[in-house]
Amino acid sequence: QNASRGRRQRRMHPNVSQGCQGGCATCSDYNGCLSCKPRLFFALERIGMKQIGVCLSSCPSGYYGTRYPDINKCTKCKADCDTCFNKNFCTKCKSGFYLHLGKCLDNCPEGLEANNHTMECVSIVHCEVSEWNPWSPCTKKGKTCGFKRGTETRVREIIQHPSAKGNLCPPTNETRKCTVQRKKCQKGERGKKGRERKRKKPNKGESKEAIPDSKSLESSKEIPEQRENKQQQKKRKVQDKQKSVSVSTVH
């Protein structure tokens, strides 16, 4: 990671030596590098109880580089920060903290939510569903003949899965009772039950009340972790595809 790493080359004067290795400009037998060659960063490395000076081409993780007229120095990021751009801006927080505009927080501000994978405060994503598809044909036990009452269903797609704090998806399946024109079943279509049913008098004013499918209600209640993984990816695909038009298709 850090190519130019220099320490003292051989035993010289115990304090300062000019015969330094690699990136060191000056070094001491005991403290390692004291100053670095141009463009290299000076950092202190802890070895046991002692700190040794090293010269690096870039600062290690957990440190940021500052260029001064006389020295380029690596400085440690704040305690809650894993990697930082400078002393004011963290780019990755330590476990248990969430990144919001360069700072590490215990909790995210209102209107944002904690993403436990990226350890960032991110936008809350609500569920988005398409419009309903047309109702299916009216059927009873998979048949469209030989009965008066049956059920029909319609479905819609989830365009955007919600994030952990997002609104849950509404049902994606709907079933309602329906009536069909009395129609003779073709040979081989009709079963015993079909013949019995045929004799029943038609029921006037049949209800067509839609009932959300219990299966679809369950499927919309995914656990937050499952939702969170998929949502960023799907959102990006939908938005990038639609470019300058709104991605919402909920009406």
Partner: antibody
Framework: QIQLQESGPGLVKPSQSLSLTCSVT?????????WNWIRQFPGNKLEWMGY???????NYNPSLKDRISITRDTSMNQFFLKLNSVTTEDTATYYC??????????WGAGTTVTVSS | DIQMTQSPASLSASVGETVTITCRTS??????LAWFHQKQGKSPQLLVY???TLADGVSSRFSGSGSGTQYSLKINSLQPEDFGNYYC?????????FGGGTKLEIK
């Protein structure tokens, strides 16, 4: 160096949609933090409208939530504002801006939009 | 929404003077507050972020301070280019609201 440039029609009729584009140069919109739309009304009052973040997710000002949409085209490095059902109250100078780690905040020059019949 | 109350709404000062503009928030914004300067016909320019960090290229005559719900921007030794409008904005909870602005005029 990063630059943002707003473009779009200067005049929009009431009840129509206002559509603006922010073209970004010198930085990828998939790398930045938050790509915002902000407007300034004739009396100089500023209003944050919303953003699209680097990962394509949005946040909008609740006062505009039913009318606003911010989308993007990553191949063109542009992001867009669409404001529906405009009224004369939406007459303002519209700015796009970005919040970045390195620069923290940069604004475009702004584009004036008048809503009038 | 967090309300931002900026004061004074306007002030007149002479070149060389020191002025202070304040911004009070209806609830804590945890130092996620920025100050902007806007000259006539131009877009706002960032001066200070995280309440007290000076943005790149901004004169050290500007300084931000405060915490919780009270923040201020101090301008030492006013220069002709400092005149114009000043705004505070928070970046805490959504929506990120602005203060009403302070118009700084030459006396």
């Amino acid at each position: 160096q990063i630059q943002l440039q707003e473009s779009g029609p200067g005049l929009v009729k009431p009840s129509q949609s206002l559509s603006l584009t922010c073209s970004v140069t010198g930085y990828s919109i998939t790398s930045g933090y938050y790509w915002n739309w902000i407007r300034q009304f004739p009396g100089n009052k500023l209003e944050w409208m919303g953003y699209i973040s680097y990962d394509g997710t949005n946040n909008y000002n609740p006062s505009l939530k039913d009318r606003i949409s911010i989308t993007r085209d990553t191949s063109m490095n542009q992001f867009f504002l669409k404001l529906n059902s405009v009224t004369t109250e939406d007459t303002a100078t519209y700015y796009c801006s970005v919040l970045l780690i390195q620069y923290f905040n940069i604004w475009g020059a702004g584009t004036t939009v008048t809503v009038s019949s | 929404d967090i309300q931002m109350t900026q004061s004074p709404a306007s002030l007149s000062a002479s070149v060389g003077e020191t002025v202070t503009i304040t911004c009070r928030t209806s609830e804590s914004v945890n130092n996620f507050l920025a100050w902007f300067h806007q000259k006539q016909g131009k877009s706002p320019q960032l001066l200070v972020y995280h309440a007290k960090t000076l943005a790149d290229g901004v004169s050290s005559r500007f300084s931000g301070s405060g915490s919780g719900t009270q923040y201020s921007l101090k301008i030492n030794s006013l220069q002709p280019e400092d005149f114009g409008n000043y705004y505070c904005q928070h970046f805490w909870s959504i929506p990120w609201t602005f203060g009403g602005g302070t118009k700084l005029e030459i006396k």
